[in-house]
């Protein structure tokens, strides 16, 4: 009788992560008597995948009933495949021996390749905000995909970016891979509503790429422009001075009025108006009692925006033209805070 052969008809099998892999194996004879075992890899470090008589293999089922007397089909199914299962699987026939069974013949092996989808790309921007005209870096990461081939693109508001660097790790063979890309983006004053998108295309995604986004509103700081103007006299001895704070982002802003360098009032921007580009405008006004001043008054509008160093704008108020009112000691009325917005 011809010597037993172990036949693994499939040189390779390709399975998607999460699915079941079928590894086929048949023997050409019932002799010698002894069990079949499945291993991943060869040599002393090989991993036991299935032993028909002993051990716990909850993910493995046999295709046929191995207890049938003349069974020669030793194919197995491995459920819930992950990239870690990739490798070459060997169907090995043992013959009964003492004390241990002895390896008799091995199949040629079946290479199991696992296709695994990349994780949703995660886009992260710089830790600190930056102002228009500055270049900032965004990173995009996606993990756990196989095979290694992958395409990554960057977009800003639908326009493809070209200034980026991408790495796929590891460089050598692995059960799964990760991609890391860094893109450089130049900020403009109009970027409050802008989005940066990282797009990943992979064979497992069937032409429907995965996208990760970052809103530039989290990254940009648009500093305000200030304008201080003197309004027509409201009443005798009173002058209304306004400070227009325009085109700032984010909203966090504190304004201080100074009269001749002395703090008169501090307020926080609350009821702001939003511009079409996502920036904000705000206005504060100060009612100055000119009769309380003998000399000209220097009024300063000082703004601290988003924790940055203060910027200021001054206005010189001439008081010589106004008659002096005796006995008045109030330089400014603190009720002069106005949260209406005037353009």
């Amino acid at each position: 009788e011809e010597e037993l052969q172990v036949i693994q008809p499939d040189k390779s099998v390709l399975v998607a992560a999460g699915e079941t892999a079928t590894l086929r194996c048949t023997a050409t004879s019932l002799i010698p008597v002894g069990p079949i075992q499945w291993f991943r890899g060869a040599g002393p470090g090989r991993e036991l995948i299935y032993n028909q008589k002993e051990g716990h293999f909850p993910r493995v089922t046999t295709v046929s009933d191995l207890t049938k007397r003349n069974n020669m089909d030793f194919s197995i199914r491995i459920g819930n495949i992950t990239p870690a299962d990739a490798g070459t699987y060997y169907c090995v026939k043992f013959r009964k021996g003492s004390p241990d069974d002895v390896e008799f013949k091995s199949g040629a092996g079946t290479e199991l390749s696992v296709r695994a989808k990349p994780s949703a790309p995660v886009v992260s921007g710089p830790a600190a905000r930056a102002t228009p005209q500055h270049t900032v870096s965004f990173t995009c990461e996606s993990h756990g995909f196989s095979p290694r081939d992958i395409t990554l693109k960057w977009f800003k508001n639908g326009n493809e970016l070209s200034d980026f660097q991408t790495n796929v790790d590891p460089v050598g063979e692995s059960v799964s891979y990760s991609i890391h890309s860094t893109a450089k983006v130049v900020l403009t004053r109009e970027d409050v509503h802008s989005q940066v998108i990282c797009e990943v295309a992979h064979v497992t995604l069937q032409g429907d790429p995965l996208r990760g986004t970052a809103n530039l509103s989290e990254t940009i700081r648009v500093p305000p422009t200030l304008e201080v103007t003197q309004q027509p006299v409201r009443a005798e001895n009173q002058v209304n001075v306004t400070c227009q704070v325009r085109k700032f982002y984010p909203q966090r802003l504190q304004l201080t009025w100074l009269e001749n360098g002395n703090v008169s009032r501090t307020e926080t921007a609350s009821t702001v108006t939003e511009n079409k580009d996502g920036t904000y405008n705000w206005m504060s006004w100060l009612l100055v009692n000119v009769s309380a001043h003998r000399d000209d008054v220097k009024l300063t509008c000082q703004v601290e925006h988003d924790g940055q160093p203060a910027v200021s704008k001054s206005h010189d108020l001439k008081v010589s033209a106004h008659p002096k009112e005796q006995g008045s000691n109030t330089a400014a009325e603190n009720t002069g805070s106005n949260e209406r917005n005037i353009y």
């Epitope: 028909q52 008589k53 051990g55 009933d65 207890t67």
Partner: antibody, heavy 114, light 108 residues
Framework: QVQLVQSGAEVKKPGASVKVSCKAS????????MHWVRQAPGQGLEWMGR????????KYNPKFQDRVTMTRDTSTSTVYMELSSLRSEDTAVYYC???????WGQGTTVTVSS | EIVLTQSPGTLSLSPGERATLSCRAS???????LYWYQQKPGQAPRLLIY???NLASGIPDRFSGSGSGTDFTLTISRLEPEDFAVYYC?????????FGGGTKVEIK
């Protein structure tokens, strides 16, 4: 569900033999080996041997080679472990376990005393 | 035969603490053939970990296994009251199959 039901407690005199049974249900009896493991009072686990229910093939721990016999009855899906020439040190709980090491019998207490 | 030596023999710990149990083999054991069991008084052993590091069905993930060659470890990250028991390592790499002497994890 998988069950391994063992025979009841036994009290034996030194020099006698004891035969413990283990009836399997809920799975294909010939699928995997059946092992016998014992545990003396306050001691650890000790592997005695195994039988292949498909063909009766056995492997014994050399320590028990001369005194243990494992058999099976496929018609009743039952395996047996017989231990002869009993001595006081054989007082233990005897377990049968399926080849997957997940399913164990409830244990059979064998007391050897004169 | 492959002798499995477990240490320590007894581990006295409080609930919430981390337990690290060692199993050393007298000769190399392939990772696929190293199992761990938990046993409570009057009960049969219960399979905890198979193939060195895989959790058996229904075993909480505070249990983990690691190791290779001759050194294997069972770790319980945060002891729960029901974890106080005796733990055994076991090899079925070669005949005769053998068990370690056991480590008793007791309440401090």
């Amino acid at each position: 569900q998988v069950q391994l039901v063992q025979s009841g407690a036994e009290v034996k005199k030194p020099g006698a033999s004891v035969k413990v049974s283990c009836k399997a249900s809920g799975f294909n009896f010939e699928d995997t080996y059946m092992h016998w493991v014992r545990q003396a009072p306050g001691q650890g686990l000790e592997w005695m041997g195994r039988i292949d229910p498909a063909d009766g093939d056995t492997k014994y721990n050399p320590k028990f080679q001369d005194r243990v016999t494992m058999t099976r009855d496929t018609s009743t899906s039952t395996v047996y472990m017989e231990l002869s020439s009993l001595r006081s040190e054989d007082t233990a709980v005897y377990y049968c376990a399926r080849g997957n090491y997940v399913n164990w019998g409830q244990g059979t207490t064998v007391t050897v005393s004169s | 035969e492959i002798v499995l030596t477990q240490s320590p023999g007894t581990l006295s710990l409080s609930p919430g603490e981390r337990a690290t149990l060692s199993c050393r083999a007298s000769s190399s054991v392939s990772s696929s053939y190293l199992y761990w069991y938990q046993q409570k008084p009057g009960q049969a052993p219960r399979l905890l970990i198979y193939s060195t590091s895989n959790l058996a069905s229904g075993i909480p993930d505070r249990f983990s296994g690691s190791g290779s060659g001759t050194d294997f470890t069972l770790t319980i990250s945060r002891l729960e009251p029901e974890d106080f028991a005796v733990y055994y390592c076991h090899q079925w790499y070669s005949y005769p199959r053998t068990f370690g002497g056991g480590t008793k994890v007791e309440i401090k």
